[in-house]
């Protein structure tokens, strides 16, 4: 999977969309998880309604919401009041039994609020690296990772 970058402004809401084949994933609940390290597990943040028929109902976990258009085949995640610590790598997942198929890998970038004059030094952007794969650009303040970019901040 290529990684798609979604950029949001600190303090505002960010909507992440994950398209999928509605028939292929028919009857499957969906989830949004946060990747813990480059090779680590993906920690569940929020999942759609336990009853698949009610997947259109928005479910919240803290400041993160999820809703699923099961006919149109679009999973939508809303990150409300975006904060610097929300930056990182996530996945949209399709669930079946104990399986989780990745629908899309998402890199969330948090941009400084141009109206906020506080120090933006704690806002994180991916740095340069040799290792990351190619990906295509997709907008809606989103793009895909460029070759050489990594989805995790360098550790000191």
């Amino acid at each position: 999977h290529n990684t798609t970058v979604f950029q949001g402004v600190a303090g505002q809401s960010l909507q992440v969309s994950c398209p999928y084949d509605s028939m292929k994933h028919w009857g499957r609940r969906k989830a949004w998880c946060r990747q813990l390290g480059e090779k680590g597990p993906c920690q569940r943040v929020v999942s759609t309604h336990n009853l698949w028929l009610l997947s259109f109902l928005r479910r919240w976990n803290g400041s993160t919401a999820i809703t699923d258009d099961t006919l149109g085949g679009t999973l939508t995640i809303t990150l409300r009041n975006l904060q610097p610590h929300d930056a990182g790598l996530y996945q949209c997942q399709s669930l079946h039994g104990s399986e989780a198929d990745t629908l899309r890998k998402v890199l969330v970038e948090v941009l400084a609020d141009p109206l906020d004059h506080r120090d933006a030094g704690d806002l994180w952007f991916p740095g340069e690296s040799e290792s990351f794969e190619d990906a295509h650009v997709e907008h809606s303040i989103s793009r895909s990772l460029l070759e050489g970019e990594i989805p995790f901040p360098p550790t000191s």
Partner: antibody, heavy 123, light 107 residues
């Protein structure tokens, strides 16, 4: 009426290649996962792998990974199971089966089956 | 892989008997389990899915129960056409393995 019609029995020699088929009708073939199941003579059912013809997403059982290739041509509603070099131990009946989809259920169960294709590999 | 173990491997019974076949998963699979019937020279037939839901057209004498690792298929009153081999299959994860089968024979 939903039907899965498999190709006829095959007799092959060890080392030969083979491709058997499973043609779907009476349903939207593209939108259903199709599995292949092996049954060796007098033995039980073994799940080999599965394909989604819509995008050819394929999953294999570790026991069969690298031993067979599962493919599909959605334009003619047909799934395939192929071997590049048959062995005597490949002698079996091979079934294709459609994964059941219910209106609220992603399932993983098989509601329609082909009639089976007997493959005999002998020198 | 999740391994499925059926018991007994064969059972002899008479028409009218109540028969129970069990299936155990090597790890928890919630209710992601199916039961199939297969007669010689024929393709398997789906009887029960989601551990206890009866497939359309299957007689009510067939029932399934269980969750987690232990499951049961019960035939309440055996009919002549029920003598066959029965398989359980887990649908929790890939590969979707079957049990080794239970052959139901006429006593």
């Amino acid at each position: 009426e939903v039907q899965l019609v498999q190709s006829g029995a095959e007799v092959k020699k060890p080392g030969e290649s083979l491709k058997i088929s499973c043609k779907g009708s009476g349903h939207s073939f593209t939108n259903y996962w199709i599995a292949w199941v092996r049954q060796m003579p007098g033995k039980g059912l073994e799940w080999m792998g599965i394909i989604y013809p819509g995008d050819s997403d394929t999953r294999y059982s570790p026991s069969f990974q690298g031993q067979v290739t599962i493919s599909a041509d959605k334009s003619i509603s047909t799934a395939y199971l192929q071997w590049s070099s048959l062995k005597a131990s490949d002698t079996a009946v091979y079934f294709c089966a459609r994964q059941r989809t219910f209106y609220y259920d992603s399932s993983g169960y098989f509601d329609y089956w082909g009639q089976g294709t007997l493959v005999t590999v002998s020198s | 892989d999740i391994q499925m173990t059926q018991s007994p491997s064969s059972v002899s019974a008479s028409v009218g008997d109540r028969v129970t076949i069990t299936c155990r998963a090597s790890q928890g699979i919630s209710n992601w389990l199916a039961w199939y019937q297969q007669k010689p020279g024929k393709a398997p037939k789906l009887l029960i899915y989601a551990a206890s839901s009866l497939q359309v057209g299957v007689p009510l004498r067939f029932s399934g129960s269980g969750s987690g690792t232990d499951f049961t298929l019960t035939i309440s009153s055996l009919q002549p056409e029920d003598f066959a081999t029965y398989y359980c299959q887990q649908a929790d994860s890939f590969p979707r393995n079957f049990g080794q089968g239970t052959k139901l024979e006429i006593k």
